[in-house]
Amino acid sequence: MAVTACQGLGFVVSLIGIAGIIAATCMDQWSTQDLYNNPVTAVFNYQGLWRSCVRESSGFTECRGYFTLLGLPAMLQAVRALMIVGIVLGAIGLLVSIFALKCIRIGSMEDSAKANMTLTSGIMFIVSGLCAIAGVSVFANMLVTNFWMSTANMYTGMGGMVQTVQTRYTFGAALFVGWVAGGLTLIGGVMMCIACRGLAPEETNYKAVSYHASGHSVAYKPGGFKASTGFGSNTKNKKIYDGGARTEDEVQSYPSKHDYV
């Protein structure tokens, strides 16, 4: 029961985490800054991974996409890549973990297969969470680096003056969403890995079985008993087939050249 709960909770936490990673990746508020403040209108800028937006105190907003790939900083490309890899891994992990859930029965899937799938999805969630945390942290570092470079320059260009002002960017809401979502995905992945240990058959308690041959050319068929974890239908070591086999509890057998223990 505890294993099922751990696995289910891990799945739900990871699901929330991956939804958060997707939300953070799509959000425009990765960084925010005050552009300028004339006596009438305050103008703000917020930037995401895909576009930049300018919002005015009046509520008017205009957004423009980063249409060029070559002109974008390598760091931004790296952040985009990390977030997308995180989403893809997380989505695959979710798909795998659905089939791995203890409460869902798919055909005659063995517990060992479910354990493997749980472990696989857990690792995927951990890597997905790490990718998101890394992506958000790289972006945050980019902003912190720029924070200490507040400068203003004025130079004469063709047809007038060009004024460049380095305003201070601050962390946007998407960074916090990304950090939390990455953390949740990571925690969910760890929970899935813990649940995997409980699902895997740790020991195989076979009862000794003596097979009594009825003829001289009877072949031994292995696998008379299934290893049980206590969760399947075969909770006690029951006979699967009867072909001349008796457990030692049932009959006292005498050694012969056809006995296999």
Partner: nanobody, 124 residues
């Protein structure tokens, strides 16, 4: 880069009208908004009016000119106009056109382009 050239300034009587223009050339697609500022001798440069270049062209004005001045734009001609009515002697100043480039660089610098200015003198 964006180049700005102002024109239309001159001498006008108090209570009269004047229209100044600002023609933009170069990378005008990168402009977010355009504004007019003025600087009287011995004073600091002050904001007059602004207009958003695209998306409906929302406007804002300094309290001192509200109701008297009107800012407009013609994106086809890449020109911004400032229609000045009921002029007062205190409106005498050098009028500068300013374009603000839409910030498309993460953590990058904000770029403002300024024209050379056009002189407006209001006589009493």
């Amino acid at each position: 880069q964006v180049q700005l050239v102002e024109s239309g300034g001159g001498l006008v009587q108090a209570g009269g009208s004047l229209r100044v223009s600002c023609a933009a050339s170069g990378r005008t697609s990168s402009i977010y908004d355009m504004a007019w500022y003025r600087q009287a001798p011995g004073n600091e440069r002050e904001f007059v009016a602004r207009i958003v270049w695209r998306s409906g062209g929302s406007t804002s004005y300094a309290d001192s000119v509200k109701g008297r001045f009107t800012i407009s734009r013609n994106t086809a001609k890449n020109t911004v106009y400032l229609q000045m009515n009921s002029l007062k002697p205190e409106d005498t100043a050098m009028y500068y056109c300013r374009a603000f480039e839409f910030p498309l660089q993460i953590g990058g610098q904000n770029v403002y382009y300024w024209g050379q200015g056009t002189q407006v003198t209001v006589s009493s």
